[in-house]
């Protein structure tokens, strides 16, 4: 699998600022690791429309991160 020159982050660039809530099937959060030095928020879209990276600095991403962290801890 061809690699990016920098790191092994899953997302390319900063990501979208928002995704319609009605289109979201699932949200996954990837925390900084040896592979990627930044947090990544990956949205799985409904109806097999693939995935999108959400800008972790966006308001929507911050809400999702909070929600997931509350659920897990």
């Amino acid at each position: 699998f061809p690699m990016f020159k920098r790191g092994r982050c899953l997302c390319i660039g900063p990501g979208v600022k928002a995704v319609k809530v009605a289109d979201i099937e699932k949200a996954s959060i990837m925390y900084p690791s040896n592979n990627c030095d930044k947090i990544e928020v990956i949205i799985t879209l409904k109806e097999n429309k693939g995935q999108r990276c959400l800008n972790p600095k966006s308001k929507q991403a911050r809400l999702i991160i909070k929600k997931v962290e509350r659920k897990n801890f």
Epitope: G13, G15, V16, R52
Partner: nanobody, 126 residues
Framework: EVQLVESGGGLVQAGGSLRLSCAAS????????IGWFRQAPGKEREGVSL????????YYADSVKGRFTISSDNAKNTVYLQMNSLKPEDTAVYYC???????????????????WGQGTQVTVSS
């Protein structure tokens, strides 16, 4: 209004070079990845190369690795595809496209892109 305008195509002999340009306007350049795709007659559109304007990360299809180089001039909102050692099988219409929120795994899947240019013809004769 979002616009992607390709230029630089033409007719070249095998072994020759061309430089394609993609001028973007109407959106925040830094928020998008710009990809080059090509479509030969009767074939599916295939991904060639991609650059992330935000950090300069690049990606190449195996078929062009070592021959093609993608670069961007963020001040001009323009992406370039330098194509060297061209082969007859590189003959196609070349399109640039802009995509946001892309995952690496889908970097060169055309369905992942939001905006497209009209294309520029590249013909490599033997």
């Amino acid at each position: 209004e979002v616009q992607l305008v390709e230029s630089g195509g033409g007719l070249v002999q095998a072994g020759g070079s061309l430089r394609l340009s993609c001028a973007a306007s109407g959106f925040s350049f830094d928020d998008y990845a710009i990809g080059w795709f090509r479509q030969a007659p009767g074939k599916e559109r295939e991904g060639v190369s991609l650059i992330s304007s935000s950090d300069g990360s690049t990606y190449y299809a195996d078929s062009v690795k070592g021959r093609f180089t993608i670069s961007s001039d963020n001040a001009k909102n323009t992406v370039y595809l330098q194509m060297n050692s061209l082969k007859p099988e590189d003959t196609a219409v070349y399109y640039c496209a802009a995509g946001q929120g892309l995952l690496r795994a889908q970097a060169l899947r055309w369905e992942s892109y939001d905006y497209w240019g009209q294309g520029t013809q590249v013909t490599v004769s033997s």
